[in-house]
């Protein structure tokens, strides 16, 4: 049967993003409509047809355009994605003979981790804090020269859609740690990044 091929995309916040749909059919459509999927009913964003060209709905006027003007292959581009743009989008190819044939492409927005790593001595112990803020939520691990060191982790969700993960390494005998390297590892979207800290006696 006739189908539409799509691909989900993940793009960085405040960068452009494109979603593409391809109608796997011998014939082009009469009109292509892009809609954003919403809880109640989909919202029309833009249409393209030979008769009327590109028609962008007012709410999307400065946000998107159709960058591949095709009736078999259609691409929409968001100029500068925000968190509100995350979600799934439907492309509807209204074809002669077979009606509306739809595909769904989903857009995920990510924010690269911002990491801070610092330490603090007190009389009898040392706290090393590693904090990573990103979207989706990052994971924080420690690589230390010896085992048996405790850590505690706190996760905080922010209104802007990012999540901060803060892990504190509690070292009971700080003298042994002086001059040694501690590594905070941040895992985000399948990539691990090392942040190194050498402890010096203040």
């Amino acid at each position: 049967q006739v189908q539409v091929v799509t691909q989900d995309e993940r793009e960085q916040l405040y960068t452009p993003a494109s979603l593409k749909c391809s109608l796997q059919n011998a014939q082009e459509a009469l009109i292509v409509t892009w809609q954003k999927k919403k809880a109640v009913s989909p919202e029309n964003m833009v249409t393209f047809s030979e008769n009327h060209g590109v028609v962008i709905q007012p709410a999307y006027k400065d946000k998107i355009n159709i960058t591949q003007l095709g009736l078999q292959n259609s691409t929409i581009t968001f100029w500068n994605i925000t968190l509100e743009d995350e979600g799934c989008y439907m492309c509807l190819f209204n074809t002669f003979g077979f009606g509306k044939i739809s595909g769904t492409a989903c857009l995920t927005v990510y924010v690269q981790p911002i990491v801070s790593l610092h330490y603090k001595f007190s009389e009898d112990h040392l706290n090393i804090t590693c904090s990573a803020t990103a979207r989706p939520a990052p994971m924080v691990f420690w690589k230390v020269p010896r085992s048996g060191i405790e850590n505690s982790t706190v996760t905080l969700s922010h209104p802007n859609g990012t999540t901060s993960v803060t892990s504190i390494l509690h070292i009971k005998d700080p003298k042994n740690q002086v001059g040694k390297e501690v590594i905070c590892q941040v895992l985000h979207l399948g990539t691990v990044t090392d942040f190194k800290q050498t402890v010096n006696k203040g």
Epitope: N25, F96, F98
Partner: antibody, heavy 117, light 107 residues
């Protein structure tokens, strides 16, 4: 040159089936939809259904309640329309045509099907 | 199903006359309408598609207009070969449906 050549006239008894062929030549068969319309004596044209030869996807007028089947043989560049459980009201001229989207340009010469006991 | 109603059902006109045939859909069909000419014992011939686009090879005296529910086929200057029955076809919604036809006779 482009041609759609239909099979010859048929006389059928009520309850029988008829299969009309439409042989295409002069173009790439899978690039155009093949449609079937019919016209009973003194009546308006009636859309029966169509097929996209590229995939073999077809769409039928539900008025025919599953009595119509449209198929194709790409190797022979031929489309077929089969109508079963024939009744006297099915006496008509059956036409095949081709379209690129909604652009209809060539038609077969028509096939008269007579249903009579 | 969408009903297509043509008017008039028949008309007689003279060579050189301007002839107008109308087609009314029972619901909005956007611009998804074609016009056909059919002569006795012959297959239909496409004249206009998407309400106002002329099919290649069709004389420019034929034109189509309208959108939504009301459509018109106009022959600006009738020629002797224009006799026959004219049908409109909607293809906005399946099943696609034809009008009942307008029989045009030359006076």
């Amino acid at each position: 040159q482009v041609q759609l050549v239909q099979s010859g006239a048929e006389v059928k008894k009520p309850g029988a089936s008829v299969k009309v062929s439409c042989k295409a030549s002069g173009y790439s068969f899978t690039d155009y939809i093949i449609l079937w319309v019919r016209q009973a004596p003194g009546q308006r044209l009636e859309w029966m259904g169509h097929i996209d030869p590229y995939y073999g996807s077809s769409n039928y007028n539900l008025k025919f309640k599953g009595r119509v089947t449209i198929t194709r043989d790409t190797s022979a560049s031929t489309a077929y329309m089969e109508l079963s459980s024939l009744r006297s009201e099915d006496t008509a001229v059956y036409y095949c045509g081709r379209s690129k989207r909604d652009y209809f340009d060539y038609w077969g010469q028509g096939t008269l099907v007579t249903v009579s006991s | 199903d969408i009903q297509m109603t043509q008017s008039p059902s028949s008309l007689s006109a003279s060579v050189g006359d301007r002839v107008t045939i109308t087609c009314k859909a029972s619901q909005d069909i956007n611009s998804y309408l074609s016009w056909f000419q059919q002569k006795p014992g012959k297959a239909p011939k496409s004249l206009i598609y998407r309400a106002n686009r002329l099919v290649d090879g069709v004389p420019s005296r034929f034109s189509g207009s309208g959108s939504g529910t009301d459509f018109t086929l106009t022959i600006s200057s009738l020629q002797p070969e224009d006799f026959g029955t004219y049908y409109c076809l909607q293809y906005d919604e399946f099943p696609y449906t034809f009008g009942q036809g307008t029989k045009l006779e030359i006076k």
